[in-house]
């Protein structure tokens, strides 16, 4: 059971966290583009992991970490001080209807993106589901062409909200279908900014 | 080339910028409703252009520009100082399935809304894709009524994220289907607010 | 990270996350409300439960957020809808889902839509389905303004703290 969240193919959010939080570094130095040294903030962009995983990049393209914000593959995004944070996430998905036609129900897929909190003052126990979004997609098939895959479909699942975090707590993204993530530029990201 | 974005009817994001950034003025005076003179911020609301284009309104209804933020049809939204900005966009879309039935693939449309950066310290070259959302819609038809258009469908494509911008850089929205934009109040907007 | 699940009720008792005691100088007007899961056929906003809160002047009255001071606010809201497929023989009409954040102000004699999303769902074509709507934007608000929501498809809401929420914070 997924901690009161939406149904997902990934029953164990912790397991997905291990898979989905790879590919990163703790910033030993701030990126040169850091224009706001006083503000804990981060914007991480989705990057594929080998084996159909979702990882996060902290330095390429628009990604950055500021003011002691840290990210590691195993532990997620750690904010450096207590405060009120606006957390946000967008995951782009893409796919095709499988070949063979059949009834639409068998083709439906429910895509889910969720943001969890773990560790710190919250304790080492079960991750806590903070925010999540979902979308059910039913890809179409050409009835006349029952052999091949259907056309590409795209969707995005995003959300954002205020969360009070303590230093040492970590936030991370869990997704239901890492094999369907769209890693094209600008499509998949998550981040945080301290607002109070 | 669309910089990693989805295929769009507008192959050249710069050209779409010209089309999609109309309907504006540079604010010679700040709107009287500017309640936060120290904070660069803007909220622009979608407004139709002649010829099925998407323009942006800077003063009507809830739209505003503050603290030296400027908007022009040709160049987009210019932020007055270096900093960390939360950029956001939501585009509502609406349409009907075309008459005549046919296969579902032919009815599918992938709606895309994208936010680009250009100019300033980033350089005068190719616009840079910052954030993007997408949604594939397959309108349904009433099988018993093959003559007329299908029922209205609605969807929204939105996103928001942190971007480090420098003074003189400009951000603008590019969309794939300006003819399908829903201009009802609250449906289509983009904006920026400096958070650090 | 451990992945042991909790039932929602157990989760609520296990997750009493203490309120922040931030230095007063850093406090800004802010609010994050969640849909009351005990009210299944209406959308009632709750504060002071789970991760919901009202901070530095925000108040909740008649299911509306009252803006404490004039300024620019980032306002956001999300809903998640769900439903079951109808039987294959049933001719299901499309289901209209919508969610809107509205402003009621002394400057306007009516509710003004600030953020609005809508969607048509065709349940007959699908298995159990989920659809989320999130939107957020910056607005210039005046002290005393009221922010409220209007939702079509309330019986289909997935009322949990992570899925249905409404908030604002001063910038």
């Amino acid at each position: 059971q997924d901690q009161g969240g939406l149904v997902t193919e990934t029953a164990d959010p912790g397991a997905q966290a291990q898979q989905g939080l790879g590919f990163q570094k703790l910033p030993e130095e701030e990126p040169e583009t850091d224009l706001s040294p006083g503000l804990p903030a981060a914007h991480l962009i989705g990057a594929p992991l080998k084996g159909q995983g979702l990882g996060w990049e902290t330095t390429k393209e628009q990604a950055f970490l500021t003011s002691g914000t840290q990210f590691s593959d195993a532990e997620g995004l750690a904010l450096p001080q207590d405060g009120l944070y606006y957390l946000y996430c967008l995951v782009g998905y893409r796919g095709r209807a499988p070949p063979g036609g059949g009834d639409p129900q068998g083709r439906s897929v429910t895509l889910r993106s969720s943001l969890y909190r773990a560790g710190g003052a919250y304790g080492p126990g079960t991750p806590e589901l903070l925010l999540e979004g979902a979308e059910t997609v039913t890809p179409v098939l050409d009835p006349a062409r029952r052999q091949g895959y259907g056309p590409l479909w795209y969707t995005s699942v995003g959300f954002g909200g205020l969360v009070q975090l303590r230093r040492g707590e970590r936030v991370y993204v869990n997704i239901s279908h890492p094999d369907m993530v769209d890693f094209a530029r600008g499509k998949t990201f998550f981040g945080a900014v301290m607002v109070g | 080339q669309d910089q990693g974005g989805l295929v769009t009817e507008t192959a050249d994001p710069g050209a779409q910028a010209q089309q999609g950034l109309g309907f504006q003025k540079l604010p010679e005076e700040e709107p009287e409703t500017d309640l936060s003179p120290g904070l660069p911020a803007a909220h622009l609301i979608g407004a139709p252009l002649k010829g099925q284009g998407l323009g942006w309104e800077t003063t009507k209804e809830q739209a505003f520009l503050t603290s030296g933020t400027q908007f022009s049809d040709a160049e987009g939204l210019a932020l007055p100082q270096d900093g960390l900005y939360y950029l956001y966009c939501l585009v509502g879309y609406r349409g009907r399935a075309p008459p005549g039935g046919g296969d579902p693939q032919g009815r599918s449309v992938t709606l895309r809304s994208s936010l680009y950066r250009a100019g300033g310290a980033y350089g005068p070259g190719t616009p840079e894709l910052l954030l993007e959302g997408a949604e594939t819609v397959t309108p349904v038809l009433d099988p018993a009524r093959r003559q007329g258009y299908g029922p209205l469908w609605y969807t929204s494509v939105g996103f928001g994220g942190l971007v480090q911008l420098r003074r003189g850089e400009r951000v603008y929205v590019n969309i794939s289907h300006p003819d399908m934009v829903d201009f009802a109040r609250g449906k289509t907007f983009f904006g920026a607010v400096m958070v650090g | 990270l451990p992945g042991v699940g909790l039932t929602p009720s157990a989760a609520q008792t296990a997750r009493q996350h203490p309120k922040m005691h931030l230095a007063h100088s850093t406090l800004k007007p802010a609010a994050h409300l969640i849909g009351d899961p005990s009210k299944q056929n209406s959308l009632l906003w709750r504060a002071n439960t789970d991760r919901a809160f009202l901070q530095d002047g925000f108040s909740l009255s008649n299911n509306s957020l009252l803006v404490p001071t004039s300024g620019i606010y980032f306002v956001y809201s999300q809903v998640v809808f769900s439903g079951k497929a109808y039987s294959p023989k049933a001719t299901s009409s499309p289901l209209y889902l919508a969610h809107e954040v509205q402003l009621f102000s002394s400057q306007y004699p009516f509710h003004v839509p600030l953020l609005s999303s809508q969607k048509m769902v065709y349940p007959g074509l699908q298995e159990p389905w989920l659809h989320s709507m999130y939107h957020g934007a910056a607005f210039q608000l005046t002290q005393g303004d009221q922010l409220s929501t209007h939702t079509d498809g309330i019986p289909h809401l997935v009322l949990s703290p992570s899925t249905v929420f409404f908030g604002a914070f001063a910038l």
């Epitope: 130095e29 080998k50 782009g92 094209a184 | 990693g4 | -």
Partner: antibody, heavy 118, light 111 residues
Framework: DVQLQESGPGLVKPSQSLSLTCSVT?????????WNWIRQFPGNKLEGMGY???????NYNPSLKNRISITRDSSKNQFFLKLNSVTAEDSGTYYC???????????WGQGTSVTVSS | DIVLTQSPASLAVSLGQRATISCRAS??????????MHWYQQKPGQPPKLLIY???NLESGIPARFSGSGSRTDFTLTINPVETDDVATFYC?????????FGGGTKLEIK
């Protein structure tokens, strides 16, 4: 800044084992990315030999069969190449590199020249 | 293994002119909506240096004279205008499937 530096013997006898070390500074090899060995033959052809992942898993080029092993010492922030049963065809310049997968190999060592000769 | 075929093997271009290098893959290197194709520049005695990642994205610090394009199996590196400092060998590399493979290289000279 992230830096990689190869070290090891420049001359190895045929049938013996080649052992090289890559020392990484400015970044923890257990925090992320994939840590590769690439070699360049005298005719300038480049060959990916294999990598060790941030999580310790390995992948090797099948052309090297069972001759190759890539390991790491997390405490020293180093990873290692061992190539058994070398022949003259294994001569060349050996590079270690950080691989960001979809972002390419963004940091390389300067390379170390290896000659297999009796 | 995915075979990458570069052409031409060598190229002589006048200063200020455009240089175009092609790389063809034996099978598609696209996945997850992106192309796992990268371009490197190597000067004598130095390691390869990343220029372009994901087929068309300029690596940080690389001049905008370099650009990349293509998808699936056909990719192009363009240098425009060519400068003296560009004399080097250029390689394409795919990371979509293990083992990683490189093209045979294109040597750029100034006319």
């Amino acid at each position: 800044d992230v830096q990689l530096q190869e070290s090891g013997p420049g001359l190895v006898k045929p049938s013996q084992s080649l052992s090289l070390t890559c020392s990484v500074t400015g970044y923890s090899i257990t925090s992320g990315y994939y840590w590769n060995w690439i070699r360049q033959f005298p005719g300038n052809k480049l060959e990916g030999m294999g990598y060790i992942s941030y999580d310790g898993s390995n992948n090797y080029n099948p052309s090297l069969k069972n001759r190759i092993s890539i390991t790491r010492d997390s405490s020293k922030n180093q990873f290692f190449l061992k190539l058994n049963s070398v022949t003259a065809e294994d001569s060349g310049t050996y590079y270690c590199a950080r691989d960001a997968y979809s972002y390419g190999m963004d940091y390389w060592g300067q390379g170390t020249s290896v000659t297999v000769s009796s | 293994d995915i075979v990458l075929t570069q052409s031409p093997a060598s190229l002589a271009v006048s200063l200020g002119q455009r240089a175009t290098i092609s790389c063809r893959a034996s099978e598609s290197v696209d996945n997850y909506g992106i192309s796992f194709m990268h371009w490197y520049q190597q000067k004598p005695g130095q390691p390869p240096k990343l220029l372009i990642y994901r087929a068309s994205n300029l690596e940080s610090g690389i001049p905008a004279r370099f650009s990349g394009s293509g998808s699936r199996t056909d990719f192009t590196l363009t240098i425009n205008p060519v400068e003296t400092d560009d004399v080097a060998t250029f390689y394409c590399q795919q990371s979509n499937k293990d083992p990683y493979t490189f093209g045979g290289g294109t040597k750029l000279e100034i006319k």
